[in-house]
């Protein structure tokens, strides 16, 4: 067979000839290649839309579930029914009511538990005589903490007042043992619930300085759209202090943020809500009960700069010109002021409440709920963008006593800052984190 | 939409009691504290008496303490107002009204108020 | 009780006239003041809280101002339906107190 000599088969090959020519690479991507392209820029484009679309929607408007439909965010937590089912009023500051004593709380007096007898409503302190593990995480738990307790052995005290019983369990919450004899150890509980108040870093007493994050691990920024609003105190992983009034303006949970473990205002990370708790309000003293808890959505991670602060004891009876500490991001001048971006400390003192209540301060409007604290010539308060944070009082460990609450002016002489006493308000704190638990 | 709507009030003599009831819709009613306040003919608005959302705070004006019981039931959305004693100077116009959820001092105020049901005491 | 007087306590007025109604104190209630709205044999509305806080739905022709003990309610430009009678209230201190009451009438 002749070979055609413009063939284009090479002469070594055994392949068969081609039908057709193969296309060259320009080609192949202008047929495949570019209409893949086009399909991706296409599909990139709308997902970039849908996005978008999702976005705005998010940020303005709320989807009410059955029937599908949107309603404009600022319809959320309004005190109206939007949605048929009423989802836009779900996820709302709630309110909870101050509820039933709790039967167990701590003395100042070491810690030591006490137990109430509910038939008599007295109050009997708890010998350690076959006081267990158990038993103390019932104590605890009736508090509505969560954590592993410790406890221990204390002596009893020569002015011990109240009788001391051996304490038993029944149905989750302790009681007094029937057959109650003697306490034969001679000692009482010391029960500690959480592991809280400690820092790293102790403050030095002068007027108003820099704060470090080391001194104070418990102070938080509680943030609406990323805007810093309110103070905050760390009480346990889940749970953070603050005042009620902080949410006055944005009722809704969404928006709400939590930024813990720096000095620096921007800097954090922040924390999401699962739900803002205020007590029960009282007509009869709109000012009272200026006191919110904050449930995180995840457990804090406890670091050198993440830290719990402690709860008051319940007898905490702190006496005029007991020195203090304030803190916070607030104002620096009361009026023309403005947000300061470093966390700033100062040592105050208990005010008297009869001079806090005098004419020429508050004329009465300081309730038993309430303490002031400032310095008797003024120049040292808590301003706006303050509330919410802690009063702190140091004894062995650091207590938040008062919640930074309001005041007329900021640091003027005879109206010192007016503080929510956080003792008041053990019973709700702890029947808060019992239900939920 | 927020609705408040009372019922009860009429003709009553002096001496006699009244209940008057006040159905609310349109918000979570177990979330709000909750005002009566009167107006009588050709006067301005007074406040009567308050109660908590929980019930737990209840207040009441010197002029009808120990005579009108307020009371509320979550579960069915309603406001009472049981009135006992009753006397000529009750004789209004009694509003169930919404207190605002401004949490801190300022908090009495009312932000809805229901039409309003008429309470004649007459011989 | 703390008193809650206004003035005057009644004015007549045309449509786009500009108004201007008091409340006076009779001790200081900071900014917890509110106004509110009622025509004949309706419920009050609640047009101003806070003194200067506008509530949803109203329109911006009202305004409030003022704090401690002396507060002012203004129409900027007096409609038709503005016609009523305007409440100032105290929620500084329990109980509640309201104001007399000013009629504004058509002139």
């Known amino acids: 067979m002749l070979q055609d000599p413009d063939s284009d088969q090479p002469l070594n090959s055994l392949d068969v000839k081609p039908l057709r020519k193969p296309r060259i690479p320009m080609e192949t991507f202008r047929k495949v290649g570019i209409p893949i392209i086009i399909a991706l820029l296409s599909l990139a484009s709308i997902i970039i839309v849908v996005v978008l679309i999702k976005v705005i929607l998010d940020k303005y408007y709320f989807l009410c579930g059955q029937p599908l439909h949107f309603i404009p965010r600022k319809q959320l937590c309004d005190g109206e029914l939007d949605c048929p089912l009423g989802e836009d009023e779900e996820h709302c500051v709630k309110s909870f009511p101050e509820g039933p004593a709790v039967a167990v709380r701590l003395s100042k007096d070491r810690s030591t538990l006490q137990v109430l007898d509910s038939a008599t409503g007295n109050w009997f302190s708890a010998c350690f005589d076959n006081f267990t593990e158990a038993l103390a995480e019932t104590a605890c738990r009736q508090m509505g903490y969560s954590s592993k307790p410790t406890f221990r052995a204390v002596e009893i005290g020569p002015d011990q007042d109240l009788d001391v019983v051996e304490i038993t369990e029944n149905s989750q919450e302790l009681r007094m043992r029937n057959s109650s004899g003697p306490c034969l150890s001679g000692s009482l509980v010391s029960l500690h619930c959480l592991a809280c108040g400690k820092s790293l870093k102790t403050p030095r007493v002068v007027g108003v300085e820099e704060a470090s994050v080391d001194s104070w691990p418990w102070q938080v920024s509680i943030q609406y759209d990323k805007q810093h609003v309110c103070g905050g105190s760390i009480l346990d992983p889940h749970w953070v202090l603050t005042a009620a009034h902080c949410f006055r303006k944005h009722t809704d949970v969404f928006n709400w943020k939590v930024r813990a473990g720096s000095d620096k205002l921007g800097s954090f990370p922040s924390l999401a809500v699962a739900k803002i708790i205020i007590i029960e309000f009282n007509p009869m003293y709109p000012k009272d009960n200026d006191i919110a808890l904050m449930k995180l959505q995840f457990p804090l991670t406890f670091s050198g700069t993440v830290r719990p602060i402690c709860l008051p004891f319940f007898d905490e009876e702190l006496t005029p010109a007991t020195p203090l500490w304030i803190i916070g991001w607030g104002f620096t001048k009361q009026n023309g002021g403005k947000m300061s971006d470093i966390l700033l400390q100062a040592s105050v003192q208990v005010i008297d409440s009869t001079r806090c209540n005098a004419d020429d301060a508050y004329q009465g409007e300081v309730t038993e709920k309430m303490m002031c604290a400032g310095i008797p010539e003024g120049g040292v308060d808590t301003c706006q963008g303050d509330s919410g944070g802690p009063l702190m009082y140091q004894s062995d460990q650091w207590h938040v006593v008062g919640i930074v609450s309001w005041g007329y002016g900021c640091g003027g002489p005879s109206t010192p800052g007016v503080y929510t006493k956080v003792s008041a308000y053990l019973n709700w704190i702890y029947n808060v984190w019992k239900a939920e638990l | 939409e927020v609705q408040l709507l009372e019922s009860g009030g009429g003709l009553v003599q002096p001496g006699g009691s009244l209940r008057l009831s006040c159905a609310a819709s349109g918000f979570t009613f177990s979330s709000y504290a909750m005002h009566w306040v009167r107006q009588a003919p050709g006067k301005g608005l007074e406040w009567v008496s308050s109660i908590s959302s929980s019930s737990t705070y209840i207040h009441y004006a010197d002029s009808v303490k120990g005579r009108f019981t307020i009371s509320r039931d979550n579960s069915k959305n309603t406001l009472y107002l049981q009135m006992n004693s009753l006397r000529a100077e009750d004789t209004a116009v009694y509003y169930c009204?919404?207190?605002?959820?401004?949490?801190?001092?300022?908090?009495?105020?009312?932000?809805?108020w229901g039409q309003g049901t008429l309470v004649t005491v007459s011989s | 009780d703390i008193q809650m007087t206004q003035s005057p306590s009644s004015l007549s007025a045309s449509v786009g006239d500009r108004v201007t109604i008091t409340c006076r104190a009779s001790q200081s209630v900071s900014s917890w003041l509110a106004w509110y709205q009622q025509k004949p044999g309706k419920a009050p509305k609640l047009l101003i809280y806070?003194?200067?806080s506008l509530q949803s739905g109203v329109p911006s022709r009202f305004s409030g101002s003022g704090s401690g003990t002396d507060f002012t309610l203004t129409i900027s430009s007096l409609q038709p339906e503005d016609f009523a009678t305007y409440y100032c209230q105290q929620a500084k201190s329990f109980p509640p107190t309201f104001g007399q009451g000013t009629k504004v009438e058509i002139k």
């Open positions: 009204a919404r207190v605002g959820r401004y949490y801190g001092s300022g908090s009495s105020l009312v932000d809805y």
């Open positions: 806070d003194a200067s």
